[in-house]
């Protein structure tokens, strides 16, 4: 029975004279992986990666087609005609074979260039929101604080002056809400199937990959 | 149109080493890999290992490890196989070959290259 | 290691016959074979790559089948020209591995 799934990086568009990765993974499997083919749009052979043979790069693509990551597979030099779809072949042992499809979008250098002016200022006002809603948690949270501390000071001095010798215990505050973290996901479950070399660079690719929310602020709230 | 010329027989002392060329032409040299196989008198084909044109890397029959070493010179589209501490198990029709656009066949074949090893 | 059978080790037939030789290998090697043709004193020349795909110049006479483990070379119309002795070869793992050869003789 094929218990496995092929995650692909789906959708994706780059600029015309660019490189872009395409990669599958094979996951929900023990299936030792036997080879990888990468087939274009029209079927025609782009690589084969054999486990035991290496890397075969179709002959006219060997100027511009690099293998990996893993065993994914590098286009460079990006043209309007690589536009299209690209699938991944998994030939495994016991499973048998799964298919992957990637979508490849090529854009034109001006229409890339257009977008990018779009989104570079949405970017920044965004980052900009973040920042300031950010600052405005850390400056209530330290304001919080600094009452709490003042109540808790003249309470202390005026038990203190009582001499009780009672000890009034002080719950230990949360950390600071509003902290800013850098989140960074690599894929779970990867390699699952692969080992050495080619399971490593698979790591260093997810790990290069990783989103990375731009300050994106983590709100941290006690209940009970 | 795709050629792949070798060098001449070779006739060698067990323990002695032979190097054999295969100068190809009528195509990119560094696009392919290249291919050894030999042939012994009146047997089957063995393939020996590759190497690829472009970046050097090789790949060899576990059974030729250490016994075969494969070389390229791209600026005049030559490959090389050297043989090392020759036996007369080791004389056969060595064939350079040019690999497949689609995998690891063996596309355009050289004519052969005979090396015996006798004392 | 993939091994690589083939049958029979060699036939007698005529010109205009229909001849088929078959090529077993140990374990699924997919589509992963080739056929090639050798002549006395000759360098073996590919036939068939991919079980089934005929390289440019191969007369269409040849032609290829099978997958998995089971695979087949015919020769529609058997010619002068095509006496000869032929090999499958796997490509699917390392060491690529040769079948015995099939001899083709005039009957």
């Known amino acids: 029975m094929m218990t496995g799934t092929i995650e692909t990086t789906g959708n994706i568009s780059a600029k015309k004279g660019g490189s872009v990765i395409l990669q599958c993974h094979l996951s929900s499997t023990m299936a030792q992986v036997t080879q990888v083919n990468w087939e274009q749009h029209d079927h025609s052979l782009l690589a084969i990666r054999n486990a035991e043979l290496g890397w075969h790069i179709y002959p006219a693509f060997k100027d511009r087609v690099a293998p990996g990551p893993g065993l994914g597979l590098t286009l460079q030099s990006l043209t309007m005609n690589d536009t299209g779809e690209y699938f991944c072949t998994y030939h495994t042992y016991p499973d048998g074979t799964y298919r992957g499809r990637i979508f490849l979008e090529v854009l034109e250098s001006s229409v890339a260039e257009h977008s990018a002016r779009f989104q570079i200022p949405l970017l920044g006002a965004m980052a900009m929101m973040l920042v300031v809603i950010c600052i405005a948690v850390i400056v209530v949270v330290v304001l919080a604080r600094k009452k709490k501390s003042l109540r808790i000071h003249s309470v202390e001095s005026g038990l203190q002056r009582k001499s009780t010798g009672q000890e009034e215990q002080i719950p230990s505050a949360p950390s600071p809400p509003g902290s800013c973290v850098q989140a960074e996901a690599a894929p779970a479950g990867l390699c699952g199937e692969q080992q050495g070399d080619d399971c490593a660079e698979l790591h260093d690719y997810f790990n290069v990959l990783s989103y990375r929310s731009l300050g994106s602020c983590s709100f941290f709230t006690e209940t009970g | 149109q795709v050629q792949l010329v070798q060098s001449g027989a070779e006739v060698k002392k067990p323990g002695a080493s032979v190097k054999v060329s295969c100068k190809a032409s009528g195509y990119t040299f560094t696009r392919y890999s290249m291919y050894w196989v030999r042939q012994a008198p009146g047997q089957g084909l063995e393939w020996i290992a590759f190497i690829d044109a472009y970046s050097g890397g090789s790949t060899y029959n576990q059974r030729f490890r250490g016994k075969a070493t494969l070389t390229v010179d791209t600026s005049i589209s030559t490959a090389y196989m050297e043989l090392s501490r020759l036996r007369s198990d080791d004389t056969a029709v060595y064939y350079c070959?040019?690999?497949?656009?689609?995998?690891?066949?063996?596309?355009?074949w050289g004519q052969g290259t005979l090396v015996t090893v006798s004392s | 290691d993939i091994q690589m059978t083939q049958s029979p080790s060699s036939l007698s037939a005529s010109v205009g016959d229909r001849v088929t030789i078959t090529c077993r290998a140990s374990q699924s090697i997919y589509s992963y074979l080739s056929w090639y043709q050798q002549k006395p004193g000759k360098a073996p020349k590919l036939l068939i790559y991919n079980a089934k795909s005929l390289p440019s110049g191969v007369p269409s006479r040849f032609s290829g089948s099978g997958s998995g483990t089971d695979f087949t070379l015919t020769i529609s119309s058997l010619q002068p020209e095509d006496f000869a002795t032929y090999y499958c070869?796997?490509?699917?793992?390392?060491?690529?591995?040769f079948g015995q050869g099939t001899k083709v003789e005039i009957k």
């Open positions: 070869q796997h490509h699917y793992g390392n060491p690529l591995t």
């Open positions: 070959a040019r690999g497949g656009d689609y995998g690891w066949y063996l596309g355009v």
